[in-house]
Structures are given as structure tokens and as C-alpha cells.
């Protein structure tokens, strides 16, 4: 089943997806599409990278992380209710049927009328930070050391189960990655 992410109307949504390039500058093509991952490629492509660049994107869809270090997490700017649905992150590893496919479910909630409390109780804001080492500048992607042989889907599921913000903070500085090569 898809991992679920939430954002409010008017906010930016964040859908995490990572891999570890085999060598610096030796990238794997990645596509993001609206709709569940099909057998090949991505349906309704919104963004694509090739062996070295972002070579296709559509309005409001962008990579805010360092994609050349494997952070291919998708940011959707200024979301509306129509952005709800399944998104596919496909890491196009060379070879037959080698692709890593991740279906991520985005749920858009109507904007709150009342101001948000100062303490962030909604896990949505904490979870994205768990999966990236990016701050305001570039940083190396790290592999999660305390949980061996864990993949992105497992981390995503785990994160959704760990609603406690203290645990979220404990994991925040680790990056869940897929190793290529």
C-alpha cells in the first residue's frame, strides 16, 4: 500500500525519494509521475532527470534537494485539492526490470482558518526532515546506520507509525537511501 503524505491547500507538499549514486556524477535517470507506477516509465510525467541533469519539469514541480547526490524528493508548490492522489517516483536502474518504484499518496487538506499552534503537533512537517540531511546548503547523503538493510518504503511506513515528535527528531539527521552499484 502507498505511504501517505499530507499538506494543506496553499502550502508546498514534499514527497521523499532517494537513492545513492554508484559514483559521483554517475547518476541514474529518475522520473516522477502523477498516478501509480506503471510497468515501465512514469505515467503523466511531471519531472524527469537524466544521466546528469533535470531535463524536464512542469510548473510547480521541482527538486529542492541535491539530485546529483541522490535526493530526488519532489516538491509541489502551492498545492490545491486537485493535487491529491498517487505519485510515482521511479529510479530507472539500468537492466531489465531493475527499476525501483515508489508510490506515494498525497492527501491535500483544506487550509486551516485558525492560526496554527506554536508547537508543531502534525507529523507532516517533521517527517520530511527525517529523510534528508539537507539544510540551507549542500550536504552528503548518509545511510541509516541503526537500521541495516532498510529501504525507503520501510522507513516511510515506520515514520508514519512513529507519531512521537521526539522519535522523529532522533531520526531526522539520517537519510534513508537505496544504494546503486
Amino acid at each position: 500500500s502507498e505511504v501517505e503524505y499530507r499538506a494543506e491547500v496553499g502550502q508546498n507538499a514534499y514527497l521523499p525519494c532517494f537513492y545513492t549514486p554508484a559514483a559521483p556524477g554517475n547518476l541514474v535517470p529518475v522520473c516522477w509521475g502523477k498516478g501509480a507506477c506503471p510497468v515501465f516509465e512514469c505515467g503523466n510525467v511531471v519531472l524527469r532527470t537524466d544521466e546528469r541533469d533535470v531535463n524536464y519539469w512542469t510548473s510547480r514541480y521541482w527538486l529542492n534537494g541535491d539530485f546529483r547526490k541522490g535526493d530526488v524528493s519532489l516538491t509541489i508548490e502551492n498545492v490545491t485539492l486537485a493535487d491529491s492522489g498517487i505519485y510515482c517516483c521511479r529510479i530507472q536502474i539500468p537492466g531489465i526490470m531493475n527499476d525501483e518504484k515508489f508510490n506515494l499518496k498525497l492527501v491535500i487538506k483544506p487550509a486551516k482558518v485558525t492560526p496554527a499552534p506554536t508547537r508543531q503537533r502534525d507529523f507532516t512537517a517533521a517527517f520530511p526532515r527525517m529523510l534528508t540531511t539537507r539544510g540551507h546548503g549542500p550536504a552528503e547523503t548518509q545511510t541509516l546506520g541503526s537500521l541495516p538493510d532498510i529501504n525507503l518504503t520501510q522507513i516511510s511506513t515506520l515514520a508514519n507509525e512513529l507519531r512521537d515528535s521526539r522519535l522523529a527528531n532522533d531520526l531526522r539527521d539520517s537519510g534513508a537511501t537505496i544504494r546503486i552499484g
Epitope: 556524477g25 544521466e51 541533469d53 519539469w57
Partner: antibody
Framework: EVQLVQSGAEVKKPGASVKVSCKAS????????IHWVRQAPGQGLEWMGW????????NYAQNFQGRVTMTRDTSIRSAYMELSNLTSDDTAVYYC????????????WGQGTLVTVSS | AIQLTQSPSSLSAPVGDRVTIACRAS??????LNWYQQKSGKAPKLLIY???SLQSGVPSRFSGSGYGTDFTLTIGNLQPEDSATYYC?????????FGQGTKVDIK
């Protein structure tokens, strides 16, 4: 010493094609990408596309899609840029530049080739 | 395409001055921003790559800063040989794009 040496100036008629060469020396040719950038007289720089000198893979700017072809010959460590269906707007200095993918930037440039399109 | 807007388009300063050139990207490009110097009739020369890294052989009076959308090239102690046009360039998304250039003159 790293060097990129380009072919000489060309004068072409509108509708014709031009092929500019870029010969590399002083480094492992297949470890780098070759980009092509042009500069019209008195204007800024315009990126045209890249070729992976190892695999031959290419990526062209949309402005040039269908009109530009980038190739390379690893045996003589040379890259080529062919531009077809020339118009007077294609009058420019054409540069090749090398780029290592790990730090994508153009660290060495050819001396430039002036292509003049005139009837 | 990602637009890069440089400011100012030209400037004039005396030898020894500290000058800064700004480059703003229309979308976030991380640190994939490079700076080039071009003298009249010559090919561009790489000064700074990935926003802050000084290219080998380039004098240390040149420095770069910024991340995301806002970047700056600083020439710390302007010299007569720094008279040139300076371009920023992004290597995040295809097509790669350049700023329109900043012409630096020595007073």
C-alpha cells in the same frame, strides 16, 4: 596542458549547414562531457547542448532541437557540432567547452569559431 | 527554462575597491551556479564553480556565495586586469542558462 582547439572561421549562405570541430588534448577525452555554447556579436552566451564523450549520449537545448547534431570520434579525441538550415541569426562565435559531471561547469574552452551567415 | 538575472548590468570602480555582482535564479538551483569572466574577443574563463568553489589558478580575491536562488560574485581587491564581462550560469536544469552579463570597468 589541457587544450581544446577548434576549426577555423566559416562563411555560409542561408539554408546551408556548418560543421565545427573541437580537438581535445592533455586529458582523458572520454572522462568529460563536451558542451557547445554560442555568442552572437555583442550579445551574451547561449548554451546549445552537450555530448557525453564516452557514450555519445546527447542533450540539446530546445531552441536547437532538429537543427543541431553533436557527435564525437574518440579515436581522434574530437567533438563536432553541426548546425543546419542556417539563418543570419546564427551568425555567432561558437565555443566548445569541457565539463566533468561531478562539478558541472565549463573549466576549459576552445578559442571559438566564427560562423558568418550571409547571402 | 530557468532564468538568471544579473545586477547591475554594468559598474565602474577604482583599483582596490571591493565589488559585488548579484545573480538571481527564477527557481531554486541548489549550489549549481558558476561564474565566468570574459575579456573582449576571448573565450570565457571559469572563476567559481558550484557557487563557492574557486577554480584552480584563479586569484583568491574572487569569491562566490549563495545557495538556492540568490548568488553573489565578489572581487575583493579590484585590479586593472579584472576589467571584463562577468556571467553567471546554472547547471541544474536543461537548458543550461547564463545571466545577461555584468560589464566591469576600472575607473
Amino acid at each position: 596542458e589541457v587544450q581544446l582547439v577548434q576549426s577555423g572561421a566559416e562563411v555560409k549562405k542561408p539554408g546551408a549547414s556548418v560543421k565545427v570541430s573541437c580537438k581535445a588534448s592533455g586529458y582523458t577525452f572520454t572522462d568529460y562531457y563536451i558542451h557547445w555554447v554560442r555568442q552572437a556579436p555583442g550579445q551574451g552566451l547561449e548554451w546549445m547542448g552537450w555530448i557525453n564523450a564516452n557514450s555519445g549520449a546527447t542533450n540539446y537545448a530546445q531552441n536547437f532541437q532538429g537543427r543541431v547534431t553533436m557527435t564525437r570520434d574518440t579515436s581522434i579525441r574530437s567533438a563536432y557540432m553541426e548546425l543546419s538550415n542556417l539563418t543570419s541569426d546564427d551568425t555567432a562565435v561558437y565555443y566548445c567547452a569541457r565539463d566533468r559531471a561531478t562539478t558541472p561547469s565549463f573549466d576549459y574552452w576552445g578559442q571559438g569559431t566564427l560562423v558568418t551567415v550571409s547571402s | 527554462a530557468i532564468q538568471l538575472t544579473q545586477s547591475p548590468s554594468s559598474l565602474s570602480a577604482p583599483v582596490g575597491d571591493r565589488v559585488t555582482i548579484a545573480c538571481r535564479a527564477s527557481q531554486t538551483i541548489g549550489h549549481y551556479l558558476n561564474w565566468y569572466q570574459q575579456k573582449s574577443g576571448k573565450a570565457p574563463k571559469l572563476l567559481i564553480y558550484t557557487a563557492t568553489s574557486l577554480q584552480s589558478g584563479v586569484p583568491s580575491r574572487f569569491s562566490g556565495s549563495g545557495y538556492g536562488t540568490d548568488f553573489t560574485l565578489t572581487i575583493g581587491n579590484l585590479q586593472p586586469e579584472d576589467s571584463a564581462t562577468y556571467y553567471c550560469q546554472q547547471s541544474f536544469g536543461i537548458p543550461y542558462t547564463f545571466g545577461q552579463g555584468t560589464k566591469v570597468d576600472i575607473k
